[in-house]
Interface confidence: low
């Protein structure tokens, strides 16, 4: 239904707290360099204006679209051109072009310092002094570093943060209470960020149809007892919610997500038997819980998939009459039978099925042609299954850090032109798949591994798009989203690459490395490892292990030495010589 004032409608639906949080996220995601105070001022102005519209929907400007209202606010910021360069040109455009322009200027890798967590005592003091400002800072800092973070989900993580601080700041040992809990939230939020970015990439590059196919597969796996009409309705609604969030329409997105959660909870009987615990929770927790609810038990009496999609005499007729609906039912039926497959794999199978029908239905004897289609799925299914087995075996043998190093070597060989920081970040993220997925039961490993890898590789593609340097990466990133991971997996050593010269300073370290936190130490060592591979792309695993063991021994020795600086300056050059010799 149409509302006289969109801003009043959203304020009323969402309530002041969520309204303000979402407006802050929106501004922080658009203008990523502005300080918290600058954004907080704008948020307060927008909120005050929304309240006047709630009081009188006919008041001046209350009938304007949210894009117009928000865009005007952003464009009124002083020194916009000095701070944001060509983004200021967006302000010369009219809506909807102005908003599109803002979206195009979102930076996936902003040059902002890492978000450092203050020490416990300081954090608790500022939280107690002003919880609202403290949480506002959290939303601002995360949103500006992750400009596509799913806004209603970020409100959920802020709520988690708030609950942890409330609990831990009351304890004697605040540090040991806060650290593991906040680490857990951070890890989950980072995964949420890359997953959502993947959804927005799908929407931006391939449109709503591609996203809806993803949603049909995912929802069919989770709700195998829901019928096709129900799954289609849920997929359509979920597509709308994600389109709005990816498009910067955060108030509409959060409002529609709340509506979808309400619908699911009111229609549990036709959706799933597993929703009740989620539906008992308050809004943010409920929507989060529904988004990762466990799969419902599969119906026991499902007929073989071949009946309707291979053996039926009407296959080509049904396909020709309504291609999208027929392919949608195939995806639904296949996905509900295979919660053990990744969504990416299910979409590849649906694509293969579609290509087979396109080819076969034009031939003289279609059934003879498409009769073997299910058998032809086999290699497509085996490939990711082998990937999971090989990588989980390697992870179990090496542990997370060793597994990350193995991936780093592999990916540096595949794309040595890519910057070392990007390779290290990618390998560290890809390596976490072991901890995240390899400890799961067998039937949950494949979906966990492949869909997580796809999301991480999407980030690799986004960063590479900014400065394309590797033909290998460009090739894999140019294809369809679901083919990316197999494409990257199939890459081998880049034979066109001219090895980097050996520079001693790249492998020169100082005593300050000794005081770094373990994570930073690992990154330093991994940076050196990537540089070694760039110098010798065909170095054997044994050679690299020898050098890295030597390097680890050197750090251990010098960091334990009484005179660390002397140790580093005398032993360092010897290490460099030994490295060169080992790789010769």
């Amino acid at each position: 239904e149409a509302h006289k004032s969109e801003i009043a409608h959203r304020y009323n639906d969402l309530g002041e707290q969520h309204f303000k949080g979402l407006v802050l996220i929106a501004f922080s995601q658009y203008l990523q360099k502005c300080s918290y105070d600058e954004h907080a001022k704008l948020v307060q102005e927008v909120t005050d204006f929304a309240k006047t519209c709630v009081a009188d929907e006919s008041a001046a400007n209350c009938d304007k679209s949210l894009h117009t209202l928000f865009g005007d606010k952003l464009c009124a910021i002083p020194n916009l051109r000095e701070n944001y360069g060509e983004l200021a040109d967006c302000c010369t455009k009219q809506e909807p072009e102005r908003n599109e322009c803002f979206l195009q200027h979102k930076d996936d890798n902003p040059s902002l310092p890492p978000f450092e967590r203050p020490e416990a005592e300081a954090m608790c003091t500022s939280f107690k002094e002003n919880p609202t400002t403290f949480m506002g800072h959290y939303l601002h800092e995360v949103a500006r570093r992750h400009p596509y973070f799913y806004a209603p989900e970020l409100l959920y993580y802020a709520e988690q943060y708030n609950e942890i601080l409330t609990q831990c700041c009351a304890e004697a040992d605040k540090e040991s209470c806060l650290t593991p809990k906040l680490d857990g939230v951070k890890e989950k939020a980072l995964v949420s960020s890359v997953r959502q970015r993947m959804k927005c990439s799908s929407m931006q590059k391939f449109g709503e149809r591609a996203f809806k196919a993803w949603a049909v597969a995912r929802l069919s796996q989770t709700f195998p007892n829901a019928d096709f009409a129900e799954i289609t309705k849920l997929a359509t609604d979920l597509t709308k919610v994600n389109k709005e969030c990816c498009h910067g329409d955060l108030l509409e997105c959060a409002d529609d997500r709340a509506e979808l959660a309400k619908y699911m909870c009111e229609n549990q009987a036709t959706i799933s038997s597993k929703l009740q615990t989620c539906c008992d929770k308050p809004l943010l927790k409920k929507a989060h819980c529904l988004s990762e609810v466990e799969h419902d038990t599969m119906p026991a009496d499902l007929p073989a998939i071949a009946a309707d999609f291979v053996e039926d005499q009407e296959v080509c007729k049904n396909y020709a009459e309504a291609k999208d609906v027929f392919l949608g039912t195939f995806l639904y039926e296949y996905s509900r039978r295979h919660p053990d497959y990744s969504v990416s794999l299910l979409l590849r199978l649906a694509k293969k099925y579609e290509a087979t029908l396109e080819k076969c239905c034009a031939e003289a004897n279609p059934p003879a042609c498409y009769g073997t289609v299910l058998a032809e799925f086999q290699p497509l299914v085996e490939e990711p299954k082998n990937l999971v087995k090989t990588n989980c075996d390697l992870y179990e043998k090496l542990g997370e850090y060793g597994f990350q190093n193995a991936i780093l070597v592999r990916y540096t060989q595949k794309a040595p032109q890519v910057s070392t920081p990007t390779l290290v970040e990618a390998a560290r993220n890809l390596g976490r798949v072991g901890t995240k997925c390899c400890t799961l039961p067998e039937d949950q490993r494949l979906p966990c591994v492949e869909d997580y890898l796809s999301a991480i590789l999407n980030r690799v593609c986004l960063l590479h798009e900014k400065t394309p340097v590797s033909e290998h990466v460009t090739k894999c990133c140019s294809g369809s989203l679901v083919e990316r991971r197999p494409c990257f997996s199939a890459l081998t050593v880049d034979e066109t690459y001219v090895p980097k010269e050996f520079k001693a300073e790249t492998f020169t370290f100082h005593s300050d490395i000794c005081t770094l936190p373990e994570k930073e130490k690992q990154i330093k060592k991994q940076t050196a490892l990537a540089e070694l591979v760039k110098h010798k792309p065909k170095a054997t695993a044994e050679q690299l292990k020898t050098v890295m063991d030597d390097f680890a021994q050197f750090l251990d020795t010098c960091c334990k030495a009484a005179d660390k600086d002397t140790c580093f300056s005398t032993e360092g050059p010897n290490l460099v010589t030994r490295c060169k010799d080992a790789l010769a």
Partner: nanobody
Framework: EVQLVESGGGLVQPGGSLRLSCAAS????????MSWVRQAPGKGPEWVSA????????RYAESVKGRFTISRDNAKKTLYLQMNSLKPEDTAVYYC????????GSQGTQVTVSS
């Protein structure tokens, strides 16, 4: 050599509690996700619970959710399983595993729930 030694099993009445421990050695315990698996007489191994290397992410089989709690102490290289509200169907040999592998050759610890 990788070694996993479970302890803490025993005979307990329905509704009772037990805390299982698994002492690990011979590998970098803090780098690995760990699981508890159980095997009832005449049945195949059943996955019970898993925890990631840092202890932040935990997962449970439907049959034990809300009753069992998995945890770990990386400094002590020990994995734990707190089992409350035990039922006769929890009777099994329980053993800890690295990742999802069930072929680590540990002895396991017998848990019997009976009145």
């Amino acid at each position: 050599e990788v070694q996993l030694v479970e302890s803490g099993g025993g005979l307990v009445q329905p509704g009772g509690s037990l805390r299982l421990s698994c002492a690990a050695s011979g590998f970098t315990f803090g780098s690995f996700g760990m699981s508890w698996v159980r095997q009832a007489p005449g049945k195949g191994p059943e996955w019970v619970s898993a925890i990631d290397s840092g202890g932040a992410d935990t997962r449970y089989a439907e049959s034990v959710k809300g009753r069992f709690t998995i945890s770990r102490d990386n400094a002590k290289k020990t994995l734990y399983l707190q089992m409350n509200s035990l039922k006769p169907e929890d009777t099994a040999v329980y053993y800890c595993t690295i990742g999802q592998s069930t072929s680590r050759g540990s002895q396991g610890t017998q848990v019997t729930v009976s009145s």
